[in-house]
Amino acid sequence: CDLPQTHSLGNRRALILLAQMGRISHFSCLKDRYDFGFPQEVFDGNQFQKAQAISAFHEMIQQTFNLFSTKDSSAAWDETLLDKFYIELFQQLNDLEACVTQEVGVEEIALMNEDSILAVRKYFQRITLYLMGKKYSPCAWEVVRAEIMRSFSFSTNLQKGLRRKD
């Protein structure tokens, strides 16, 4: 499945929106920094399977959508930027949805893909628990925003690689 060029553009637009959403200086939140353990191995360019990567991208965007769709998130960010962010994520989900279905139909996921989806889910579990533990403070949200930007940047680079491999 060829991820359309629009998907890569959408990913970049989502990154720009995430950057614009920042309200606090990252430096004022250094004490709240946390290593969420982004599951880089899932997206390892040397060994990943295409179907696995696409499934993991989808899970990552779906979990990001859910994370930023909460009441606590709505209170933390500018409503207009958040709405634009939702639209970009929704479009990416649609692109990936078509790709996931095309890549493997609706057959059960191979063991490798199971583990990749679980790794992404656990990563977002850590983010969720971190936010709850910090009582959704502005600095906690800033740390999470920066973290999601990093993971999006990583996946954007990988998607370019995916297209080159085609």
Partner: antibody, heavy 119, light 108 residues
Framework: QVQLVQSGAEVKKPGASVKVSCKAS????????MHWVRQAPGQGLEWMGE????????IYAQKFQGRVTMTRDTSTSTVYMELSSLRSEDTAVYYC????????????WGQGTLVTVSS | EIVLTQSPATLSLSPGERATLSCSAG???????LYWYQQKPGQAPRLLIY???NLASGIPARFSGSGSGTDFTLTISSLEPEDFAVYYC?????????FGQGTKLEIK
């Protein structure tokens, strides 16, 4: 509020198939994996598998591989669990439960569907 | 498959007493993915504790959870009549997700 409403009780003969439905409301259906858990009379809970309603991908417990099929209909926000080649030990209450993260994991359950397999 | 073994199978106590329920995993479980559920006859399970030690919404403070690795505990500090039920531990740390066989908490 989140609600999961399941189809009614079924009585089936050994060797037959059963299809249980779970209609979701109160949230964005496509955004959360849906799981199926069963409970035989007087027994514990057993995870059967899950489906992502967005693209229909499934992950099944090895025990049910080849016998279970989970599907979804996004137009009606409904997921289905079909179990084939039924045997008496499949007599159980079948639950759908919504995935999520943190306090949302299996925080929402259907009311359960009793499937009785008897000749 | 991670096997979760709960003990005791049945616990007979009186209201006001302290209850300690154990859950032992066959291999290590990430504490973030260890949950506890309560089930009463004829009802679906109800989430009690998520991520080992966090109380779910609406759950009274008499419930608490602890543990790490392979050993986890659910404690009810002072039993109320409505606490008598079956309790299950559950892990989603690795596939297939599993539940313990349950501990039945009954009135002595």
């Amino acid at each position: 509020q989140v609600q999961l409403v399941q189809s009614g009780a079924e009585v089936k003969k050994p060797g037959a198939s059963v299809k249980v439905s779970c209609k979701a409301s109160g949230y964005t259906f496509r955004n959360y994996w849906m799981h199926w858990v069963r409970q035989a009379p007087g027994q514990g809970l057993e995870w059967m598998g899950e489906i992502n309603p967005s693209h229909g991908r499934t992950i099944y417990a090895q025990k049910f591989q080849g016998r279970v099929t989970m599907t979804r209909d996004t137009s009606t926000s409904t997921v289905y669990m079909e179990l084939s080649s039924l045997r008496s030990e499949d007599t159980a209450v079948y639950y759908c439960a919504r995935g999520g993260l943190g306090p949302a994991w299996f925080a929402y359950w259907g009311q359960g569907t009793l499937v009785t397999v008897s000749s | 498959e991670i096997v979760l073994t709960q003990s005791p199978a049945t616990l007979s106590l009186s209201p006001g007493e302290r209850a300690t329920l154990s859950c032992s995993a066959g291999s290590s479980v990430d504490s973030s993915e260890l949950y506890w559920y309560q089930q009463k006859p004829g009802q679906a399970p109800r989430l009690l504790i998520y991520s080992t030690s966090n109380l779910a919404s609406g759950i009274p403070a008499r419930f608490s959870g602890s543990g790490s690795g392979t050993d986890f505990t659910l404690t009810i500090s002072s039993l109320e009549p409505e606490d008598f039920a079956v309790y299950y531990c559950h892990q989603w740390s690795s596939y297939p997700f599993t539940f313990g066989q349950g501990t039945k908490l009954e009135i002595k």
